[in-house]
Amino acid sequence: AGVFELQIHSFGPGPGPGAPRSPCSARLPCRLFFRVCLKPGLSEEAAESPCALGAALSARGPVYTEQPGAPAPDLPLPDGLLQVPFRDAWPGTFSFIIETWREELGDQIGGPAWSLLARVAGRRRLAAGGPWARDIQRAGAWELRFSYRARCEPPAVGTACTRLCRPRSAPSRCGPGLRPCAPLEDECEAPLVCRAGCSPEHGFCEQPGECRCLEGWTGPLCTVPVSTSSCLSPRGPSSATTGCLVPGPGPCDGNPCANGGSCSETPRSFECTCPRGFYGLRCEVSGVTCADGPCFNGGLCVGGADPDSAYICHCPPGFQGSNCEKRVDRCSLQPCRNGGLCLDLGHALRCRCRAGFAGPRCEHDLDDCAGRACANGGTCVEGGGAHRCSCALGFGGRDCRERADPCAARPCAHGGRCYAHFSGLVCACAPGYMGARCEF
């Protein structure tokens, strides 16, 4: 028996662009709380008990109200640890799901409203009694920093909390073959911890830290299959526990990767690339099933009835990602044509069109000159989304209604004098200069 402890250090916007300012607002104050779900990291774990190792809910954190203009801080967190007691042996490898929830404290009818802000999941190897392990996980634009450990509750001790420490005064109950371990003479040592990474399927150990292979397997962690056909030479090295040690055609022969994983050889053994929903050395573990509710934003979870089958989230319009966790930036596809401004309203897209264009995507080019008259003999020129008048000499302005002073722009160079004329302008050039604008 023992307790898994989780300490949340910070929750806030992650690095990089697009990070949210805050889950709360000046109009809608809120506070955070966390939920942790633990599962033993074994592929056969039943799906009907999604948190088979246990679950815990934190207290509510302090109320937070965003200050407009202030930089986005890490959000105030609940006090204390999240503690998940476990009754049996600590499994050593476990899956976790940590959810960050927001409690909105506005004027909701019927009390506060809760919504899931972020969910992170992972699989870790952890010995009970060890130091705190630190971790950083990102969920969308959010970042969660936390530490965790597993500790045994007296009288249990050991990396799995399966050894019982008895008082020295109690008579020894160590069975044959179980040696007492120092410093308590009456403490019985039962389970062996094999070498870290020793294949759970093809390895075994008689001594702590050992990794011996079943016949047909080799390598330091018993992950490499042996081809006995390559041992025809009597001089070929062989062993009682490993069979023939000469490696066969390759460690990926027979594809050791489960659940549709693809195998690639590495210098020392092999590596599995797992399909969505699976992980582990051989893709044998599915950490999250539909029972865990992995689909955000109203996504529909299908498949994944048990940990050996991957789940798939069917996302509602406007969301994407394997867990429907990403809002689709539909404006990034630039659906508004002719320079229209795109507005994503969540439930719909709206285009705000420039003058001279219309339609849901600003696809219609309006006749800019329709119903437009240019005064004083000017002619209408269509284009650029707005009508323009080409005015007769002596007139200007949008509709050629203003009498133009052709000398206002001082068109005569080198000190030439400008005179307005009915047909335009005339430059009287200074001595030594010539040309229509005295430019020579």
Partner: nanobody
Framework: QVQLAESGGGSVQAGGSLRLSCAAS????????LGWFRQAPGKEREEVAI????????HYRSSVKGRFTISQDNAKNTVYLQMNSLKPEDTAMYYC?????????WGQGTQVTVSS
Amino acid sequence: QVQLAESGGGSVQAGGSLRLSCAASGYTYTSNWLGWFRQAPGKEREEVAIIYTGSGSTHYRSSVKGRFTISQDNAKNTVYLQMNSLKPEDTAMYYCAARFSEYNYWGQGTQVTVSS
């Protein structure tokens, strides 16, 4: 606490049969495998037969294939080893073992002696 208790060992003439039983208790998580190992005097411990508890698939040492059969009774949490056509070289201490993630558990063993 995981406990494995073997029974069914004994002495038999070459060509005879024995059935070993291993009763497992004290755990709630499914093991990776349950199996039978043996160790003859002066030799290394070696696996005889393994049953993968999730899938029910089996693994046999090449020298016992066709003679020994491993099976499990999930309701009783017991694994069996049916040994037929026994040979003198099968003489050894037979141990029941269980693998849970990185942990190995062993029973106390039961002696099998095959005389010619």
